[in-house]
Amino acid sequence: VPRWRQQWSGPGTTKRFPETVLARCVKYTEIHPEMRHVDCQSVWDAFKGAFISKHPCNITEEDYQPLMKLGTQTVPCNKILLWSRIKDLAHQFTQVQRDMFTLEDTLLGYLADDLTWCGEFNTSKINYQSCPDWRKDCSNNPVSVFWKTVSRRFAEAACDVVHVMLNGSRSKIFDKNSTFGSVEVHNLQPEKVQTLEAWVIHGGREDSRDLCQDPTIKELESIISKRNIQFSCKNIYRPDKFLQCVKNPEDSSCTSEI
């Protein structure tokens, strides 16, 4: 008799999830020799232990603590780039500007990037059929809790000037409900962080508006100022040129506004 299985609203666990996590861990340690002390099998065991046999709507940050401990990593606290709804450009930027780091440039962020996972209460099975959706089912699901946990820790580690890349093409350039707006903003430490500098990325070729005057950016400025952190904002009118100028800063065309 087939066992009844909870049907969630979100997509199921990414295929080859265990293999992908293990392979990514091995790749990461190859690429980042400073993380060679990490035992990737132990990392996978800790990752698995956070959600296997647990109800996928009842996951806590505590469940991820063994994984957090194994994945402890020191990144230069003054070289942190946060992002919201513009992941690809943020990653293209840190690929060129090698001394800056997004969360996905750290081991734990790299392991989980673009993956979905969940288990089932009281069985050791991974659910490849469906997983809880944050809105339609529950917020304390394995994926959401993971990102909340690592994002909080990443923001807490930041110091000096912290940069955030925001998508100027969206109706809410700053969204209070995004991970940046709901977790990272509130976990920057005022005693360590002097300034949050927002880079608003323009989408349209001919878009010359000052998106730093957008009401949602003003809202972000207000939240940040109330936390005793300075705020600054820059328009990036031409993201393609911006990346090109990061690659080749001596290019003559890079003195004008980008």
């Epitope: 293999e19 392979a23 091995v26 190859e30 060679r36």
Partner: antibody, heavy 120, light 107 residues
Framework: EVQLVQSGAEVKKPGATVKISCKVS????????MNWVQQHPGKGLEWMGW????????DVAEKFQGRVTITADTSTDTAYMELSSLRSEDTAVYYC?????????????WGQGTTVTVSS | DIQMTQSPSSLSASVGDRVTITCKAS??????VDWYQQKPGKAPKLLIY???NRYTGVPSRFSGSGSGTDFTFTISSLQPEDIATYYC?????????FGGGTKVEIK
């Protein structure tokens, strides 16, 4: 069985560009970093750079920066190494190579090599 | 970059002889040194990884030792099929760097 099969020998003129391919089989392409190694005739080995095929992230040795582009096509499980502004000293055999799960960070898997000759 | 100084650059020995090759790193590389065998016209072949671990299928006459900056590769009893060039490589830091190679010949 893991296999790395490289494209055939190339003869190029100085100033030209060469693009070498490395098609893999026997494993999931995105699960491993692909490295490229240069060997001049009768000489030693020199690491050129790597690519993480899953994300397209690369790192190229300082000596080759500006002239070497490493790419990957996940739809065909193929890595590429492009070397531009060719000069006679680029005449060499080029290998793709990757690590394995039971070999530390050594390279147990190598392509057969692609000979590039630069001559006017 | 880390320099890997390999010696000797060539050697000639008789079948059954013990052959030793050394590699010195310009800075500490822990035990992240690998040894390769390369025959003419062929790709290198991994023999030893992490200084002293024999790779799968590699005969027991091949061994490696060392850590930090000084590493040794040994063929306990040279066989005719061991005629090749041997390279050390440090895999501790990017960029990976190779020793200059040791050409082993039979007397």
């Amino acid at each position: 069985e893991v296999q790395l099969v490289q494209s055939g020998a190339e003869v190029k003129k100085p100033g030209a560009t060469v693009k070498i391919s490395c098609k893999v089989s026997g494993y999931t392409f995105t699960d491993s970093v692909m490295n490229w190694v240069q060997q001049h005739p009768g000489k030693g080995l020199e690491w050129m750079g790597w690519i993480d095929p899953e994300y397209g992230r690369t790192d190229v040795a300082e000596k080759f920066q500006g002239r070497v582009t490493i790419t990957a096509d996940t739809s065909t499980d193929t890595a590429y190494m492009e070397l531009s502004s060719l000069r006679s000293e680029d005449t060499a055999v080029y290998y793709c190579a990757r690590t394995g799960y039971n070999s530390g960070y050594g390279f147990p898997y190598w392509g057969q090599g692609t000979t590039v000759t630069v001559s006017s | 970059d880390i320099q890997m100084t390999q010696s000797p650059s060539s050697l000639s020995a008789s079948v059954g002889d013990r052959v030793t090759i050394t590699c010195k790193a310009s800075q500490n590389v822990d035990s992240d040194v690998d040894w390769y065998q390369q025959k003419p016209g062929k790709a290198p072949k991994l023999l030893i990884y992490k200084a002293s671990n024999r790779y799968t299928g590699v005969p027991s006459r091949f061994s490696g030792s060392g850590s930090g900056t000084d590493f040794t590769f040994t063929i306990s009893s040279l066989q005719p099929e061991d005629i090749a060039t041997y390279y050390c490589m440090q895999s501790n830091t990017h960029p990976r760097t190779f020793g200059g190679g040791t050409k082993v010949e039979i007397k």
